[in-house]
Interface confidence: low
């Protein structure tokens, strides 16, 4: 009989997505002896850490190691002992810690240094912990979902993917939404780039990729909410926001201290008579799209074809995986559907959006207000960015597939990041037995 | 029904501070914000400030900033509205409003006050 | 502050239509809501809202009055000018605070 988990043949590796409003630690597992493998790494454990993102323990940090243990505990409690002293612990951090390095990479590296010493105190193997590029989180997001869904390799999988199933080795693009920045990155159909900032080469399986990726700093969903409230205010009836994304009969109070502590409404700040304004909900897709757009500036752009704010966008080529806040949006929307168009996307938002609240409360019930409150924002946003901002069209969004997991593991950054720092994409096709090689990204 | 009901007419010296008042009935004046407009004899509207008496949140027009001061009592659903150092030309009529948040349709005035100011 | 200017005073007969004008320095539009209202007023009496929201109805007020225009340029219609409707028509903003237009006065001719 097979012994039902040999240690030595299962490895484990952990990774802390330290994102701008909250925490995650996922857990993965594969077997040793198939770890140059594409599609042999998979997601058993995501735990949530309970509270906001580490860059908020700012004035805190003597609680970011209450903060890390209940995860870290149960990352004990699922990996064997026996595996704990070589199971690597990385942990990343994206926009909300690369904004607070812009206010004070003092206080940046204060967190950092208390996160890293609470990690250090577990049995694991810490790898360390740092802020990630926007560059790099692009990167192992598209590394992430391309890896999972075998399209790295030349040989038959020995799983089926559905809905994404394709039988051609073209790689997806990805699509990234944060709470605080959103990426894209995707292999466009010209190899040659206008933009090098832009443009990664990498050699992955034996096969050379030329790929796309930009990072949008405060581009993400709720600092987008943060942005469009400092630019509204400017010219709104004083302390009342009369605000067309949320639902009628909304009232919530800001406080101006708060819309002025990110540094992505710098560029609206204004001495205002107030210290508080009230947001009140009038529930108008139409109106909050053209808000929305307002934070785009598509009016300069010095390459043939741009996104937005001068960025360079190539045109879109082939399928995209849309994850993380894109998907978890949408799916609370109940948008993810490959059959629903984007004109019933549009119907679909302009209807929620104008639900009163009491209403919406109510249907919900379940759901902290909080969060509940922005989804019609949220949705109105992503169909902005994704149409106006990347180009999509009514056609080409049929080419956009909302993802949750893939095969039961996250679609998301983390993995691919750690497939990268244990060297387990190779940069050639991997021979019968595994080879050690590191990649280029 | 809504109804507001301001003080009776004041006559002032120059220098001197006058307090008008302005009772709402028929709803609570933090379902509005409230506003004050004066009208000198002969003269157009001049809007000169609103209080929020949810939040005890006051503006002025620039032109009265110095001098107006707007206040609210939510326990006698009642709006103050004071202003010093007079001169010969605020001799006006001065209004209440209300203005339904969030600002639609400004449904009530009261029934203005005359003040004048005279040596 | 927005600054408003009216057309001047205006005599009209009656049955006639009557015209105001209304112009505002900057815009008063907000994400597709206008936020202009129309006031008459008489003798001795409060401002009575007419128009708000620029061609919103105000309840009560008869459907001769209408109020169109958006962005910076507003007019007050009266379609069919009556003996009651002579008063002093005022155009108001409340995007920004509030602002008063100096007014026109309508007279029978």
């Known amino acids: 009989t097979q012994n039902k988990a040999l240690p030595e043949n299962i490895k484990y590796g952990i990774v802390l997505d330290a994102g701008s409003s909250h925490t995650s630690l996922y857990i993965y597992k594969w077997p040793a002896e198939k770890e140059n493998d594409t599609g042999v790494v998979h997601q058993v454990e995501e735990c949530r850490v309970k509270g906001p993102g580490i860059s908020k323990y700012v004035q805190k940090v003597n609680e970011i190691g209450i903060y890390l243990t209940d995860c870290m505990e149960r990352a004990r409690e699922v990996i064997p002992r026996s595996q704990h002293q070589e199971t690597p612990v990385y942990l990343g951090a994206t926009a909300g810690m690369r904004l607070l390095r812009m206010e004070s990479e003092e206080l940046a590296d204060r967190v950092l240094d208390v996160v890293e010493r609470s990690l250090s105190n577990y049995p694991f193997d810490f790898q360390g912990a740092r802020i990630i590029t926007g560059q790099e989180e692009g990167a192992y997001g598209w590394i992430t979902i391309n890896y999972l869904l075998g399209k790295f390799s030349q040989k038959t999988r020995w799983f089926s993917i559905v809905p994404y199933e394709t039988n051609n080795q073209e790689t997806f693009g990805a699509l990234d939404l944060g709470g605080a920045s959103t990426q894209i990155t995707f292999v466009p159909q010209n190899q040659t780039t206008e933009s090098p900032d832009n443009a990664l080469q990498f050699r992955l399986y034996g096969k050379d990729y030329n790929v796309y990726t930009h990072s949008f700093l405060c581009y993400g969903k709720d600092q987008a909410l943060w942005q469009k409230l400092a630019k509204d205010i400017q010219v709104a009836s004083n302390e009342i926001l009369r605000d067309p994304c949320f639902h009628p009969g909304y009232k919530k109070v800001v406080n101006v201290s708060d819309l002025y502590k990110t540094p992505c409404t710098k560029r609206f700040e204004m001495t205002l008579p107030f210290q508080q304004f009230e947001i009140q909900g009038i529930g108008n897709y139409q109106q909050c799209h053209q808000s929305v757009l307002e934070l785009f500036n598509t009016s300069y752009c010095p390459y043939s074809q741009c996104a937005f704010n001068g960025i360079f966008l190539p045109p879109l080529q082939g399928d995209f995986g849309a994850f993380s806040a894109f998907y978890f949006v949408m799916n609370f929307l109940n948008l993810t559907s490959e059959k629903v168009s984007q004109e019933k996307v549009t119907e679909m938002m302009k209807k929620f959006c104008s639900q009163p609240w009491e209403e919406i409360k109510t249907s919900y019930a379940g759901v902290k207000e909080k969060y509940l409150s922005e989804y019609c924002f949220s949705g109105t946003y992503i169909l902005s960015l994704l149409l106006q901002g990347y180009h999509f069209t009514a056609d080409s969004w049929e080419h956009i597939h909302f993802i949750g997991k893939i095969q039961g593991s996250d679609a998301g950054w983390t993995l691919g990041y750690m497939l990268n720092l244990t060297n387990m994409i190779p940069a050639e096709q991997p021979l019968s037995t595994p080879l050690s090689h590191s990649t280029y990204v | 029904e809504v109804q507001l009901v301001q003080s009776g007419a004041e006559v002032k010296k120059p220098g001197a501070t006058v307090k008008i008042s302005c009772k709402v009935s028929?709803?609570?004046?933090?379902?509005?914000?409230m506003h004050w407009v004066q009208q000198a004899p002969g003269k157009g509207l001049e809007w000169m400030g609103r209080?929020?008496?949810?939040?005890?949140?006051?503006k002025y027009a620039e032109k009265f900033k110095n001098r107006v001061t707007i206040t609210a009592d939510t326990s006698t659903n009642t709006v103050y509205m004071e202003l010093s150092s007079l001169r010969s030309e605020d001799t006006a009529v001065y209004y209440c409003?209300?203005?339904?948040?969030?600002?639609?349709?400004?449904?009530?005035w009261g029934q203005g006050v005359m003040v004048t100011v005279s040596s | 502050d927005i600054v408003m200017t009216q057309s001047p005073d205006l005599a009209v007969s009656l049955g006639e239509r009557a015209t105001i004008n209304c112009r505002t320095q900057?815009?008063?539009?907000?994400?597709?809501?206008?936020?202009m209202n129309w006031y008459q007023q008489k003798p001795g009496q409060p401002p009575k809202l007419l128009i708000y929201?620029?061609?919103s109805l105000a309840s009560g007020v008869p459907d001769r009055f209408s109020g169109s225009g958006s962005g910076t340029d507003f007019t007050l219609t009266i379609s069919s000018l009556q003996a009651e409707d002579v008063a002093v028509y005022y155009c108001?903003?409340?995007?920004?605070?509030?602002?008063f237009g100096g007014g026109t006065k309508v007279e029978i001719k």
């Open positions: 028929g709803d609570s004046i933090t379902a509005y914000f």
């Open positions: 108001q903003q409340s995007r920004n605070l509030w602002t």
């Open positions: 929201l620029a061609s």
């Open positions: 409003a209300t203005e339904r948040v969030p600002g639609f349709e400004t449904d009530y």
């Open positions: 900057q815009t008063v539009d907000h994400y597709g809501t206008t936020y």
């Open positions: 209080i929020d008496p949810d939040h005890e949140r006051t």
